[in-house]
């Protein structure tokens, strides 16, 4: 978790002098509770936006937006703590809006936004906005949270972001798998424009079952430049096991930008349709 373009963070708006600060996610009001605390944020919204760094890289960011309730507690609102927790790693990053002037009611509802938390493809985050100071131990909570799931690199808009392109999202291998005679599979796919090796991982399963009955790995050496974007054809020999008929073919590239952590593509061959077994015809026809 990190912030995009850290030095350009702004939270001031007409009628409010405000500064964005790093936060330890443990505001002082936890340790020294106040008697009077503001109410919770209203209408928390999270959107996925895309932002360029000064280097020209494109990153997905969480755009966080919320409004204030129209009650007198804004007189005691000193700021807000924005927290993003990545659920699979438990990593948390916080920033604090520090109000340098008192808020006053005005003709339209106060609205705040922040769009600098960089998020990763296919990750889930808990986004929380806490008004400050935080409530006394048994006080009503004054925060709002939402769990936000970022699309993965298969998503059309994510595909062109820097983290996705680094993991090989622009490569479309267009895999075809064909069943041949004599227990063989022909796998064909389009090579990318990089001199790097590939691995084909074959996993076979029985019909309607999910435990594998055969596994095989096939190494494909790095292509020469004249072979870039060409089709690579590989014939794999299967184990002669009756009913081991559903095959998943996965192609793992080893691009320089992602090494052994590149996006994999796969294709599946289903078991052949079994024809309905007809009634056996007797060898002879009885005459009576």
């Amino acid at each position: 978790l990190r912030l995009l373009d850290h030095r350009a963070l702004v939270c001031s708006q007409p009628g409010l002098n405000c500064t964005v600060k790093n936060s330890t996610c443990l505001d002082d009001s936890w340790i020294h509770p106040r008697n009077l605390t503001p109410s919770s944020p209203k209408d928390l919204q999270i959107q996925l936006h895309f932002a360029h760094t000064q280097q020209g890289d494109l990153f997905p960011v969480a755009h966080i937006e919320w409004t204030l309730q129209t009650d007198a507690s804004i007189l005691y609102l000193e700021g807000a703590e924005l927290s993003v927790l990545q659920l699979n790693t438990n990593e948390r990053l916080c920033v604090r809006f520090e109000f340098l002037s008192k808020l006053r009611h005005h003709h339209r509802r106060w609205r705040f936004t922040f769009s600098h938390f960089v998020v990763d493809p296919d990750q889930e985050y808990e986004v929380t906005v806490h008004h400050l100071p935080k409530p006394i131990p048994d006080g009503d909570p004054n925060h709002q949270s939402k769990n936000f799931l970022v699309p993965d690199c298969e998503h059309a808009r994510m595909k062109v972001t820097t983290p996705c392109m680094s993991s090989g999202s622009l490569w479309d291998p267009n895999i075809t798998v064909e069943t041949l005679e004599a227990h063989q599979l022909r796998v064909s796919f389009t090579l990318w424009n990089e001199s790097t090796h590939y691995q084909i991982l074959l996993t076979s399963f029985p019909h309607m079952e999910n435990h594998s009955c055969f596994e095989h790995m096939h190494h494909i050496p790095a292509p020469r430049p004249e072979e870039f974007h060409q089709r690579s054809n590989v014939t794999l020999t299967l184990r002669n096991l009756k009913g081991c008929c559903r095959h998943q073919v996965q192609i793992q590239p080893f691009f320089s930008s992602c090494l052994n952590d590149c996006l994999r593509h796969s294709a599946t061959v289903s078991c052949p349709e079994m024809p309905d077994t007809p009634e056996p015809i007797p060898d002879y026809m009885p005459l009576w």
Partner: nanobody
Framework: QVQLVESGGGLVQPGRSLRLSCAAS????????MHWVRQAPGKGLEWVSG????????DYADSVKGRFSISRDNAKNSLYLQMNSLRPEDTALYYC???????????????????WGQGTMVTVSS
């Protein structure tokens, strides 16, 4: 033009099933999370279920968990709600709604809904 059209509602007995469909047009359907929202007679809107752009994540309101099943077919620009074991309290106008922004939030919308259908009425009564 941009629109969502629901179908499949009707009168059904308690315990029976119904399948709602929602046909989308005018926007890139497979970019966005989609949701079902209902409104019982004389009540407010209640979020029922949501599904992410690629069906990878799905969530349900506690009141329908285990009985309703949401799905989508991006090739057909369609959203579905399979409703089993229907109860009288499921009687409502069911709306299909598009998430305003990219991404998916558990327990409802991330950023509000910007396209709604006209709704299809489901009445559960003996």
């Amino acid at each position: 033009q941009v629109q969502l059209v629901e179908s499949g509602g009707g009168l059904v007995q308690p315990g029976r099933s119904l399948r709602l469909s929602c046909a989308a047009s005018g926007f890139t359907f497979d970019d966005y999370a989609m949701h079902w929202v209902r409104q019982a007679p004389g009540k407010g809107l209640e979020w029922v279920s949501g599904i992410s752009w690629n069906s990878g994540s799905i969530d349900y309101a506690d009141s329908v968990k285990g009985r309703f099943s949401i799905s989508r077919d991006n090739a057909k620009n369609s959203l579905y709600l399979q409703m089993n074991s229907l109860r009288p309290e499921d009687t409502a106008l069911y709306y299909c709604a598009k998430e305003k922004s990219l991404g998916f939030c558990r327990g409802g919308s991330c950023s509000g809904f910007d396209i709604w259908g006209q709704g299809t009425m489901v009445t559960v009564s003996s």
